[in-house]
């Protein structure tokens, strides 16, 4: 997520993906600023301020800052623009900074919902975190119940949200099988994809797990999961829904 | 791609070329047999209609891309909070009419998982058929180049992008310039390798010129959008 979270001074800051932020990640910038940038062709006008150039094939209307998506096109900024730009930006920069700071706080505090309430995308209503992933749909679109599973970290560790504890926990490998893996992949959005499900040693130091209650009968996978502080196999589920991220070079290396 | 090299077959198997009117317009990244990640600015009106788009996968040369070999697009989903002026939330999804068949030359890239840590100057790669010099033409062959992530704090400094970078963006390149994405690379991948797996870190979005000093490439920060992506995939069908 490209936010610099604090980390040991010797190593310096990291880009960390916190994942599962309340939507939408970042508010549009304040109305005073957007007038400054307009989509514009791929030409450069030397200036202390960047030409804003989306990298796509584009042409456009009278710019203030030349905005260039990264896709081919062409037109140049005039020096008038440059002057207007400097004035607007001095003002703009301050306002953007303030608005971004406020906007981010607002977003990270749980959108327009107070405390850690969760907003339903479909209706904009707020629901209590204890009702999120509790097996009962509280959002009209059911999104409080279909975002209860995620893959975590570079080892694809399957985590399930506990509405009791209001936090994510790895799934213990005990009694886990491929069918559950397929169901979890489906719930994440991988309709017809499933690659592998295996137990890996949990090196995260987790002391809290979600375990399968095998006697729960033929019910929804999440209704079978219960909270446990122990995992006898000492392994957590690593789930890959799709054989991704392998190119010819890396497949050669891995042989 | 400026300052890159032509790609070998299968090196970037998730890279697609997105055509309108038989012209390469944007790049994209395969994430499942049916779904492509690209940039929202690629699909601004009137190009939000799916039938305008044809995706080509596993083909390195533009001249080998003809309509019958392409994949028609069924659906175009632009991020609801995309801002065309600031390029904030510059990400979109395309669903293909029929699923891609994976092989050595056509494979998906991994979406980043929450909890993944990247070094401030993580080594990454960019690829695409964009211009190989500023104001240049689209490239006939797929090119790729090595770039480094640039911390947002540094990228937002007064001498670089002066607070234009939001947390939904990520900068990559070199402050001395020379290597960068360029026009025509939009929507394409910024990837990094971790645990011998390639992860989609960004989608090519914008920049000031191409490969200029203190003007690195700016990419949509895919890490921020993984939940939104999964939600679109879930909601579909």
């Amino acid at each position: 997520m490209a936010l610099n979270s604090g980390s040991p001074p010797a190593i310096g800051p990291y880009y960390e993906n916190h994942g599962y932020q309340p939507e939408n990640p970042y508010p549009a910038q304040p109305t005073v600023v957007p007038t400054v940038y307009e989509v514009h062709p791929a030409q450069y006008y030397p200036s202390p301020v960047p030409q804003y150039a989306p990298r796509v094939l584009t042409q456009a209307s009278n710019p203030v800052v030349c905005t260039q998506p990264k896709s081919p096109s062409g037109t140049v900024c005039t020096s008038k623009t440059k002057k207007a730009l400097c004035i607007t930006l001095t003002l703009g920069t301050f306002l953007v900074g303030a608005a971004l700071a406020a906007g981010l706080l607002w977003k990270f505090m749980g959108s327009k919902c107070s405390n850690s309430g969760i907003e339903c995308d479909s209706s904009g209503t707020c629901i209590n975190p204890s009702n999120w992933c509790d097996g009962v749909s509280h959002c009209p679109g059911g999104e409080d119940e279909n975002r209860c599973v995620r893959l975590y970290g570079p080892n694809f560790i399957l985590q399930v949200y506990s509405s009791q504890r209001k936090s994510w926990h790895p799934v213990c490998q005990d009694d886990w099988n491929e069918a559950y893996g397929r169901a979890a992949c489906r719930d994440m959005g991988y309709k017809n994809n499933f690659y592998s499900s295996q137990g890996i040693v949990d090196d995260s130091g987790s002391t809290s797990f979600m375990k399968l209650n095998t006697s729960a009968g033929n019910v929804d996978i999440y209704k079978k999961l219960y909270h446990s502080d122990a995992c006898s196999s000492k392994a957590v589920v690593s789930l890959r829904c799709i054989a991704c991220g392998v190119n010819l070079n890396s497949s050669r290396q891995s042989r | 791609i400026v300052g890159g090299e032509s790609a070998l077959p299968g090196a970037w198997p998730w890279q697609v070329s997105l055509h309108v009117q038989n012209v390469h317009v944007c790049g994209g990244s395969i994430i499942t047999p049916e779904w492509i990640v690209t940039a929202a600015h690629c699909v601004e009106k009137p190009l939000n209609n799916p039938w305008h788009w044809t995706a080509f996968a596993g083909i390195l040369r533009q001249s080998f891309m003809f309509y019958g070999a392409g994949y028609q697009v069924e659906k175009v989903i632009s991020h609801p909070n995309y801002d065309s002026k600031t390029k904030n939330n510059d990400i979109a999804l395309m669903k293909l009419q029929k699923p891609l068949t994976f092989n050595d030359l056509v494979k998906p890239v991994c979406l980043p998982n929450p909890g993944m840590m990247l070094q401030p100057e993580q080594l990454c790669w960019i690829s695409g058929w964009g211009a190989t010099e500023e104001k240049g033409k689209t490239s006939e062959v797929l090119n790729a180049a090595k770039v480094l992530l640039i911390e947002t704090q540094r990228c937002n400094s007064r001498y670089v992008y002066d607070n234009l970078i939001t947390p939904a963006m990520i900068c990559a390149g070199f402050l001395q310039g020379n290597v960068d994405s360029c026009q025509g690379d939009s929507g394409g991948p910024l990837v990094t390798s971790k645990n011998n797996i390639w992860w989609l870190i960004g989608d090519t979005s914008w920049g000031s010129g191409c490969a200029k000093a203190y003007r690195p490439g700016v990419y949509g920060n895919v890490m921020v959008f993984t939940d939104w992506i999964y939600r679109q995939m879930r909601a579909d069908g």
Partner: antibody, heavy 117, light 112 residues
């Protein structure tokens, strides 16, 4: 070679429905979008809608949304257009046409629909 | 909705003459990404289905005689037949595909 075959004529009564067909051959049916176009006697061409044979994704001209329904049968490489609640106003020649990029490169011969009691 | 206007609605010329017909759209049909226009010309001979002549405003479809030329950009387009032949008797339609699809009213070409 590419061919789009349509029956020459259909005669139906007012208030009824009709399903017009367009059988494609000579190319990969599921690769190309298919369009339907109407031409009333002595009039110009009007775009009705578009369908993709692989997924069945459709898009309609607002004017025809409640009148026309597009479907396909992949197994027989045939596109269909159902027209409902027919009146004499619906009497016209109906064409199917294949989309290449953003233009119609092949057209069927057209079906003349006559709505009459 | 984009409105397509064609003029004249009909014209009569002798074989061998040069003919131009106009098509105007209510908004620009230029795709700034590809620098091509979303405009095509079709020929419909009496009793036949339409046939593609020109696409992207100026690209001639293969097999179309080179006496047919499309030109223009943005909102104003022209179809020119440099030397009309008897078999060119037809109605000519322009069509936009910038936003959905709309045909012009047609120009009827008659041979004197």
């Amino acid at each position: 070679q590419v061919q789009l075959q349509q029956p020459g004529a259909e005669l139906v009564k007012p208030g009824a429905s009709v399903k017009l067909s367009c059988k494609a051959s000579g190319y990969s049916f599921t690769t190309y979008w298919m369009h339907w176009v109407r031409q009333r006697p002595g009039q110009g061409l009007e775009w009705i809608g578009i369908i993709h044979p692989n997924s069945g994704t459709t898009n309609y001209n607002e004017k025809f949304k409640s009148k026309a329904s597009l479907t396909v049968d992949k197994s027989s490489s045939t596109a269909y257009m159902q027209l409902s609640s027919l009146t004499s106003e619906d009497s016209a020649v109906y064409y199917c046409a294949r989309l290449l990029w953003d233009y119609f490169d092949y057209w069927g011969q057209g079906t003349t629909l006559t709505v009459s009691s | 909705d984009i409105v397509m206007s064609q003029s004249p609605s009909s014209l009569a010329v002798s074989a061998g003459e040069k003919v131009t017909m106009s098509c105007k759209s209510s908004q620009s049909l230029l795709n700034s990404r590809t620098r091509k226009n979303f405009l095509a010309w079709y020929q419909q001979k009496p009793g036949q289905s339409p046939k593609l002549l020109i696409y992207w405003a100026s690209t001639r479809e293969s097999g179309v005689p080179d006496r047919f030329t499309g030109s223009g950009s943005g909102t104003d387009f022209t179809l020119t037949i440099s030397s009309v032949q008897a078999e060119d008797l037809a109605v000519y339609y322009c069509k936009q595909s910038y936003n959905l699809y709309t045909f012009g009213g047609g120009t009827k070409l008659e041979i004197k």
